[in-house]
Every structure is written in structure tokens, then in C-alpha cells.
């Protein structure tokens, strides 16, 4: 069981949408629902997600990256991992950084994954700069 | 299958060279050759690879740290990672950042990956600071 | 054999100490024993933290974050990986910054896995931002 | 609507100090940033620095530096550059302008403040 | 500093004619596949408008007869069919690193 999405442009809204179709997209054995990747099987996981976020103008607004779990029988979301960058980069200068997350997880069957952004004008999609993936243990 | 490369001094070009040797290094059942490793069983990898950049007087020159794969099936090799930073440190100053990429890549024989940089002289090639490796899934 | 453990705010002194019980944690088939963890059989392993280092007002103090290992055959430590950074915020700014680490290493029965940072009082410990885990290949 | 509105014109001896303030309506100030143009009569225009709206920190066109200080303040949407030890040839207009990161340009502009250097 | 250089500075042109407005950077503006080159339209006793960014995207609200093209060091600005109202002064500025840089302008006037 494994997924390997990326980036996906049209993302107007949160949680992120991923390519799951194109290019060099994995999706076996787990499936991907509006932003999601829904866990059929429990066991353990590693999940991880890059996010690429770049500007023109710096104006240092906090940036932040999570990787979430939803499930019904829960009320509340719960932050699996999260990255958070504040001053980290020179005002008005173009910058680029990325934040990276990866580690291992107790999933459990309907479990669904999502990755949140703080800034989402300001995450660039290419496949190989902003990603989301997992694979069974 | 497994391999964990280390820094080598001695880089020259591009791709990075990668110590195969001494050290903290894991080489098995994948090969080593020229920069890159060399797949010998198609299937699903999880690959990695930190680089550990820094200067003595920061000019924030764009730095990238990319993963990339070439099959001598393919005309061009393909881009599977990589990580941008720009305006990252104070002009002037002594400064250090590193780049972290890691992600499920479907690979075939006879594919061959390697890592590449934009500012060879900005890396630093200590074991524990800037590596490559993978793992078979 | 897997573990997952996360910050633990009251952590006073290096290296740091782990959350084992409460929470995302995840502990089995490898022992926590005072900041680290003991591998009990030899073998592949991929191991991985993250620290997630923020301040009120940057003095860019270097920071750095280290995963080492300590076997009682061996008289020195030896740092598996390393994350560094100099000059990553704008000074008298709020600022905040993570540090990311994972690789494969060949462990052996008793090795001890220690995480180490340069300012702790910089770290926050919250569980999604701050983690120390492995599993075996 | 997007609307950046610059303070009145201004008549200041050669030696003293002017502050000219723009401030933003329609839109979320501290998304983006603000930066200074200034433009001598019948000259080109001058960039002169920029300024985040969010962080409050400046970075200055070299030319200007030790004489121009940029500010902000969030709680009234409105930034500030202040420019001393005045001289004649620095009357001119002087306008604001916002950049928004995730863009390539200054998208609005205030509509100016004359500031006239004269004995 | 990157140094723009604007020619010519005035263009005479009759109205209905095209215009071709150029400008040269003292070093390349392209990063990452995307050209920092922008050009603003001024009229007298008004701010500058943005006209064009990153060399070819046309700003929101801004007329189709305008149009942008150019990479690396050679921008051009170009008015197909030229309008009353589009006689004014016309800058490019690029906005590749700080400090920004502007042309000296082009007039552009009624022949």
C-alpha cells in the first residue's frame, strides 16, 4: 500500500488537492478522496509531505504546513506533524523554502490523510517541489 | 536493497560524487557507478538525500538540491525531487541551511539516480551532514 | 520493530528527552531508556527526527540538531546525521524554523539512539512539531 | 475597492525632515508589501526601499540609506517613509505602492505627495 | 545594479498605427523560467499604472491591444492599434532583485 501524489495547481481551497494521475503519481492499495488519502487497512505508516513555498516580495507572513488525520468516529482533526517557518527571509527580496515532514504512523481503517497550508498564494505545485505520500510498513 | 552515500570532498561537477565506501555507508543490492545508483530490480523505493549548504559571507545566491533519474530509454532524464532556496540569510554573514527531499518513486532496472546542486562550492560534504541514499519497499 | 516519540517540554538537559506513553507515541519492539532508544536486534533500520526551533527575538544563535549513536563497545559517540543553521532570521524578529533528519543505517543489538541540539531553550517540544522515530527495514 | 491614500503636499527647508504617510483600505495590509518610488519634476521614477507590512522591517535602496526610514502601523492599515537632511533634489513626488508576494509587480499605487525642497 | 535602458525616448506615432516600445536590461532577469520585467503606463499629474508583469501576462483590466514580449536582457512593449488615450509615458522596471530599477521612460506622442 503506497502513495506518492503532487502537486496540483488548481488548489483553490484547504486541505490541498493532488495530482493522482499524472506524471510520477503512485496510488496502490490506498485511496485519494477531495484533498485526501484514505487509509483501508490499519496498520502502520510512513507519511510525509514536501511544500514548496516561494514569493516575490517578502513580507514574512507566517508560513505553516500540516499533515492531518480525519476520521468520523473522532469529533476533532488531529495534527499529525507540522512545520512552521517566521522570519525567513530579507523584506521585499524574492525567496524560496520548503518545509519537509515525514514519519510513522498507527493508521487505522477510514482514516483520512490531509496536508494544510497557512499561505495557500504563496505554494508553488511542481511535481517534484510540493509532494504527499505514504506507504505501508 | 539499500544504500546510504555519504559526502565525498572531492566533487568536482555534477552530478555529485558520493563516498561508497568508508564510513557510516550501506551498499546492497544496488550498485554504485559515476554519481549514481543503479537500480537493479524494478519496484517501489523509498529515496532520500540531505545536502548541507553554507558560506562564509552570504550572498544569497539561489541554491537548488535535486533528485533526478536517467534511463538510457529515456531522452531526458526526470526530475523526482528537488528543493529551492532563495534569501535565506543575511547579507554578509556566516550562514548555514540544509535541504531535505524524501519521497516513494516506482523505479526500473537500469535506472540510474543522482543528485545535483547549483552551488557545488557551498556544500559541505560531511558524512552526518550531506548523504543520498534509498531503500526498497 | 518501530517507534515514533515526541517532544516532552520538561526536557532540561541533553539529550533530549522523549514522550513514550501519551499521545501520536509509538513503541515496539525497541526500548526507551532515558532519551534514547535501545535497538534489540541487529538490522536495517530508518531512522528520523525533526525539531522544530523558534524564538521570541533572533539573535541567529547556530543551531544545531544531531542524531547520534552510543554502544558501550565504542568510546565515542558517533553522529549519524546532523542539521545545522546559521543566519536564518532577521534579527530582533519573532522567528521560527525546523530541522529534519532521516536515513538508513545498519544498527546493532545495545546501540543507543540520542537526539542533541545546540540552544534547547529554542526548541518546542509540541508533539507534531518535535519527534525522534524509527523503524526496522 | 483597493484604494492606497497618501498624505498632502508638503513644503520643508533644505536640512529638515518630511514624513509622508499612505495608507490601505480594501484589502488585507499585511499581505503585502509596500514599497517607496519617488519621482523628480519631469524625471524618471526612483525606487527607494520597501517595507514589510507584517514584520515591520525595511530594506532601503543603498542611495537613500542613513536618510530614509520606513515604518509601519498595522493597527491603522498605514505605512510610513520619513526622509531627513533634505536637499532640493530631493523635491519630487513621492509615491507608495503595494507588491503582493505571490505576484511579479506593484499593482496599485497611491496617488502621490508632492514634497518641495526650497530656502 | 541591474541598469534598464529604455529606447527610443519619444516615439512619434499616429493613432490606429502600432507602437513598439523596447528596453534592455544590463543583465538577465530571467529566473526559473519566468521573466521579472514589468512596464507601467504613466499619464501626466497621475501615478503609474501596471500595464504588463513578468514580461507577457496582461494586468487585469488592462485593454488586449497592449502586449508584452521578451526574455533574458531584450523586453518589448506593444500597442497594435494605437487609442487617444494611450499617449502617455511608458516605463519598464524589473523586479528580478533589489534595488528595482526603472527606464529612464518612453514618451510615446501624437504624430
Known amino acids: 500500500k503506497v502513495a506518492h501524489l503532487t502537486g496540483k495547481p488548481n488548489s483553490r481551497s484547504m486541505p490541498l488537492e493532488w495530482e493522482d494521475t499524472y506524471g510520477i503519481v503512485l496510488l496502490s492499495g490506498v485511496k485519494y478522496k477531495k484533498g485526501g488519502l484514505v487509509i483501508n487497512e490499519t496498520g502502520l505508516y510512513f507519511v510525509y509531505s514536501k511544500v514548496y513555498f516561494r514569493g516575490q516580495s517578502c513580507t514574512n507572513l507566517p508560513l505553516s504546513h500540516k499533515v492531518y488525520m480525519r476520521n468520523s468516529k473522532y469529533p476533532q482533526d488531529l495534527v499529525m506533524m507540522e512545520g512552521k517557518m517566521m522570519s525567513y527571509c530579507t523584506t521585499g527580496q524574492m525567496w524560496a523554502h520548503s518545509s519537509y515532514l515525514g514519519a510513522v504512523f498507527n493508521l487505522t481503517s477510514a482514516d483520512h490523510l490531509y496536508v494544510n497550508v497557512s499561505e495557500l498564494s504563496l505554494v508553488n505545485f511542481e511535481e517534484s517541489q510540493t509532494f504527499f505520500g505514504l506507504y505501508k510498513l | 536493497k539499500v544504500a546510504h552515500l555519504t559526502g565525498k570532498p572531492n566533487s568536482r561537477s555534477m552530478p555529485l560524487e558520493w563516498e561508497d565506501t568508508y564510513g557510516i555507508v550501506l551498499l546492497s543490492g544496488v550498485k554504485y557507478k559515476k554519481g549514481g545508483l543503479v537500480i537493479n530490480e524494478t519496484g517501489l523505493y523509498f529515496v532520500y538525500s540531505k545536502v548541507y549548504f553554507r558560506g562564509q559571507s552570504c550572498t544569497n545566491l539561489p541554491l537548488s538540491h535535486k533528485v533526478y533519474m536517467r534511463n538510457s530509454k529515456y531522452p531526458q532524464d526526470l526530475v523526482m525531487m528537488e528543493g529551492k532556496m532563495m534569501s535565506y540569510c543575511t547579507t554578509g554573514q556566516m550562514w548555514a541551511h540544509s535541504s531535505y527531499l524524501g519521497a516513494v518513486f516506482n523505479l526500473t532496472s537500469a535506472d540510474h539516480l543522482y543528485v545535483n546542486v547549483s552551488e557545488l562550492s557551498l556544500v559541505n560534504f560531511e558524512e552526518s551532514q550531506t548523504f543520498f541514499g534509498l531503500y526498497k519497499l | 520493530k518501530v517507534a515514533h516519540l515526541t517532544g516532552k517540554p520538561n526536557s532540561r538537559s541533553m539529550p533530549l528527552e522523549w514522550e513514550d506513553t501519551y499521545g501520536i507515541v509509538l513503541l515496539s519492539g525497541v526500548k526507551y531508556k532515558k532519551g534514547g532508544l535501545v535497538i534489540n536486534e541487529t538490522g536495517l533500520y530508518f531512522v528520523y527526527s525533526k525539531v522544530y526551533f523558534r524564538g521570541q527575538s533572533c539573535t541567529n544563535l547556530p543551531l544545531s540538531h544531531k542524531v547520534y549513536m552510543r554502544n558501550s563497545k565504542y568510546p565515542q559517540d558517533l553522529v549519524m546525521m546532523e542539521g545545522k543553521m546559521m543566519s536564518y532570521c532577521t534579527t530582533g524578529q519573532m522567528w521560527a524554523h525546523s530541522s529534519y533528519l532521516g536515513a538508513v543505517f545498519n544498527l546493532t543489538s545495545a546501540d543507543h539512539l540520542y537526539v542533541n541540539v545546540s540552544e534547547l531553550s529554542l526548541v518546542n517540544f509540541e508533539e507534531s512539531q518535535t519527534f525522534f522515530g524509527l523503524y526496522k527495514l | 475597492q483597493v484604494q492606497l491614500v497618501q498624505s498632502g503636499a508638503e513644503v520643508k527647508k533644505p536640512g529638515a525632515s518630511v514624513k509622508v504617510s499612505c495608507k490601505g483600505s480594501?484589502?488585507?495590509?499585511?499581505?503585502?508589501?509596500i514599497h517607496w518610488v519617488r519621482q523628480a519634476p519631469g524625471q524618471g521614477l526612483e525606487w527607494m526601499g520597501v517595507?514589510?507590512?507584517?514584520?515591520?522591517?525595511?530594506s532601503y535602496n543603498q542611495k537613500f540609506k542613513g536618510r530614509v526610514t520606513m515604518t509601519v502601523d498595522k493597527s491603522t492599515s498605514t505605512a510610513y517613509m520619513e526622509l531627513s537632511s533634505l536637499r532640493s533634489e530631493d523635491t519630487a513626488v513621492y509615491y507608495c505602492?503595494?507588491?503582493?508576494?505571490?505576484?511579479?509587480?506593484?499593482?496599485?499605487w497611491g496617488q502621490g505627495t508632492l514634497v518641495t525642497v526650497s530656502s | 545594479e541591474i541598469v534598464m535602458t529604455q529606447s527610443p525616448a519619444t516615439l512619434s506615432v499616429s493613432p490606429g498605427e502600432r507602437a513598439t516600445l523596447s528596453c534592455k536590461a544590463s543583465?538577465?532577469?530571467?529566473?526559473?523560467?519566468?521573466?521579472?520585467m514589468n512596464w507601467y503606463q504613466q499619464k501626466p499629474g497621475q501615478a503609474p499604472r501596471l500595464l504588463i508583469y513578468?514580461?507577457?501576462n496582461l494586468e487585469s483590466g488592462i485593454p488586449a491591444r497592449f502586449s508584452g514580449s521578451g526574455s533574458g536582457t531584450e523586453f518589448t512593449l506593444t500597442i497594435s492599434s494605437l487609442q487617444s488615450e494611450d499617449f502617455a509615458v511608458y516605463y519598464c522596471q524589473h523586479s528580478r532583485e533589489l534595488p528595482y530599477t526603472f527606464g529612464q521612460g518612453t514618451k510615446l506622442e501624437i504624430k
Open positions: 543583465q538577465s532577469v530571467d529566473y526559473d523560467g519566468d521573466s521579472y
Open positions: 505602492a503595494r507588491f503582493p508576494d505571490w505576484d511579479y509587480a506593484m499593482d496599485y
Open positions: 480594501g484589502y488585507t495590509f499585511t499581505d503585502y508589501t
Open positions: 517595507i514589510s507590512t507584517y514584520q515591520g522591517d525595511a
Open positions: 513578468a514580461a507577457s
